[in-house]
Interface confidence: low
Amino acid sequence: MATAERRALGIGFQWLSLATLVLICAGQGGRREDGGPACYGGFDLYFILDKSGSVLHHWNEIYYFVEQLAHKFISPQLRMSFIVFSTRGTTLMKLTEDREQIRQGLEELQKVLPGGDTYMHEGFERASEQIYYENRQGYRTASVIIALTDGELHEDLFFYSEREANRSRDLGAIVYCVGVKDFNETQLARIADSKDHVFPVNDGFQALQGIIHSILKKSCIEILAAEPSTICAGESFQVVVRGNGFRHARNVDRVLCSFKINDSVTLNEKPFSVEDTYLLCPAPILKEVGMKAALQVSMNDGLSFISSSVIITTTHCSDGSILAIALLILFLLLALALLWWFWPLCCTVIIKEVPPPPAEESEEEDDDGLPKKKWPTVDASYYGGRGVGGIKRMEVRWGEKGSTEEGAKLEKAKNARVKMPEQEYEFPEPRNLNNNMRRPSSPRKWYSPIKGKLDALWVLLRKGYDRVSVMRPQPGDTGRCINFTRVKNNQPAKYPLNNAYHTSSPPPAPIYTPPPPAPHCPPPPPSAPTPPIPSPPSTLPPPPQAPPPNRAPPPSRPPPRPSV
């Protein structure tokens, strides 16, 4: 790569080299209607084309190459410029996003009559002029230069081309070189950002078509989506920015997420995680409902920006703190009620001779006479399903809308025995949406998960009440507080089966059997942990398996559902 001396600009400002970006997309941005690959990135694209005498008989191939490539950059925010050079550099078509102007520019390009020397640096000068002047609303758009030349540059001409390419780079451009025929790859690697930015065409001009896809793949920088696209007003969130080419900045520490709020203020945020196809960024806290933040990405610490059509909006979200307080009060009331209910059991112990046991009840009958549902029973003799102390590192893959794929992958405790019953409670099959997210059968409200849990709790309380009421002292029963008298008897007292540890022979460890649900109990909401329903495959690639140090962890919760 270039030395510091080579990169130094102007009158010796070596330190001013801004280590600007190298952006290489890992994959094609998308597909066009005709099925070919396309790029949806919003940046400025400059073609710097050699029209010296040596390409006289190959101009058609050069033109066709540019025309084919130009039609693959389809973002409405992408601007293009055609620059030709021989003994001087000429801007044939100034930077424009107007497709009609681009069509006319291509027509002008077709008419070019090559001739003259190879002053490539003049072409770079014309690009740098535009990069500097064509600022969009006060910020510089990311620029990509694709320079095409044939033959070797004379020593001085090479030096000047390199200097001017460095000037373009210092203005935020990424430089690619296409070398045809008798080019010097070492020279081009120094003019371009790196050797990886050189596209050698050794089989002559007719082979130019063969590199169109690889140029497209490497030069396409695009932002495709943000998740979530709606965030709660006044709350802090993390946004996943999906796209291509983020990982290949010359220095990933220089990647920034930029939020242009209501077309005025721009806030730049450092991403927590930079992957080739997505960024995990802290979203700015937007105080008001209805605010809009246009998403941009800089690969060079804010020197220039890749624009997109992705907008993040704010909405009103219900406050969870009220709900938390309400639940706390409810819990306290419940604790008091339980204390009031169970206190007489603690303090009034009935001492009676136990009657001989009745005939053994059928194990298949519950005390309400209904058949017992069979649930898996886990031998939880070893706690800490995630290793000693339950703190074995657990990696969470974040799926769309904050869901995780790990619920179905939790490790069970070592030596835990899972007994699956023959008959399971049947859950209604969730329907798949077109985006592979599951939707509950009934319309979901924000309180649906809580309601389901409260219903289940209510049923348990009713059953508990029925069971404990049998044990309550009747009027006239006497006894002393916490003064137990053991009754010697061969058979244990046969109370209703509410003991979780009731087994015919002592197990090596307690066996926990979840209480059976009442027949009218609704199925657990999707957030319920049992039974595990495999989550749909995430549309995002997984973040790095072990997050690097000093990087914030992924969001600890999915974003709240906007209030209906």
């Epitope: 130094a8 009158i11 010796g12 400002f13 001013l16 002029e129 500097y132 001085d156 000037r167």
Partner: antibody, heavy 117, light 107 residues
Framework: QVQLVQSGAEVKKPGASVKVSCKVS????????ISWVRQAPGQGLEWMGG????????NYAQKFQGRVTITADESTSTAYMELSSLRSEDTAVYYC??????????WGQGTLVTVSS | SSELTQDPVVSVALGETVSITCQGD??????ASWYQQKPGQAPLLVMY???RRPSGIPDRFSGSTSGNTLSLTITGAQAEDEADYYC??????????FGGGTKVTVL
């Protein structure tokens, strides 16, 4: 057409300061450095320092460090050179020139600064 | 900083060839340039790099390098070539250094 137009001649007393301007046209002002070169009567050329407007930070010759300040105003495409603590030996013609890093390809017409008590 | 040394005065007969030399340690030819200055005028770039002429400069001017010495050659000197010629380069800290100048007289 590239042009660099400098401000008019100045007469200053020793210890004073002088500020010479250089307004450019015909090219992207910020993309090129502007250097300042002076020439005392009957003497050779002497480089004082320069600035790349887009970055705003100047680079000075050792001899003038601390006495010279070079600035650029992008809005008016004008570069400035201010020399303080003037001495009689600072009497010279001061030139601004477009610096492409390997040559000064365009020069201003020069500004004569006379330091005399 | 580095110094560039030039011969103070060189004479040439009209139509003859003259070479002006510029010597300096660590001289890097790709930063080298030559300027012509006529009395009362601003300097004018006549050569840069090893042998690059800006547009408008006649082809009788040429440049060359040999070790630590730069040369500017005028082949077939004309009366209008009478002037002071300064060589210039950058030192290791990228500061610009000028030679002392050579006065070319066309006889």
């Amino acid at each position: 057409q590239v042009q660099l137009v400098q401000s008019g001649a100045e007469v200053k007393k020793p210890g004073a300061s002088v500020k010479v301007s250089c307004k450019v046209s015909g090219y992207t002002f910020s993309s090129y450095a502007i250097s300042w070169v002076r020439q005392a009567p009957g003497q050779g050329l002497e480089w004082m320092g320069g600035i790349i407007p887009i970055f705003g930070t100047a680079n000075y010759a050792q001899k003038f460090q601390g006495r010279v300040t070079i600035t650029a105003d992008e809005s008016t495409s004008t570069a400035y050179m201010e020399l303080s603590s003037l001495r009689s030996e600072d009497t010279a013609v001061y030139y601004c020139a477009r610096d492409t890093d390997y040559m000064f390809d365009y020069w201003g017409q020069g500004t004569l600064v006379t330091v005399s008590s | 900083s580095s110094e560039l040394t030039q011969d103070p005065v060189v004479s040439v007969a009209l139509g003859e060839t003259v070479s002006i030399t510029c010597q300096g340690d660590n001289l890097r030819d790709f930063y080298a340039s030559w300027y012509q200055q006529k009395p009362g005028q601003a300097p004018l770039l006549v050569m840069y790099g090893k042998n690059r002429r800006p547009s408008g400069i006649p082809d009788r001017f040429s440049g060359s390098t040999s070790g630590n010495t730069l040369s500017l050659t005028i082949t077939g000197a004309q009366a209008e070539d009478e002037a002071d010629y300064y060589c210039s380069s950058r030192d290791n800290s990228k500061h610009v250094v000028f030679g002392g100048g050579t006065k070319v007289t066309v006889l």
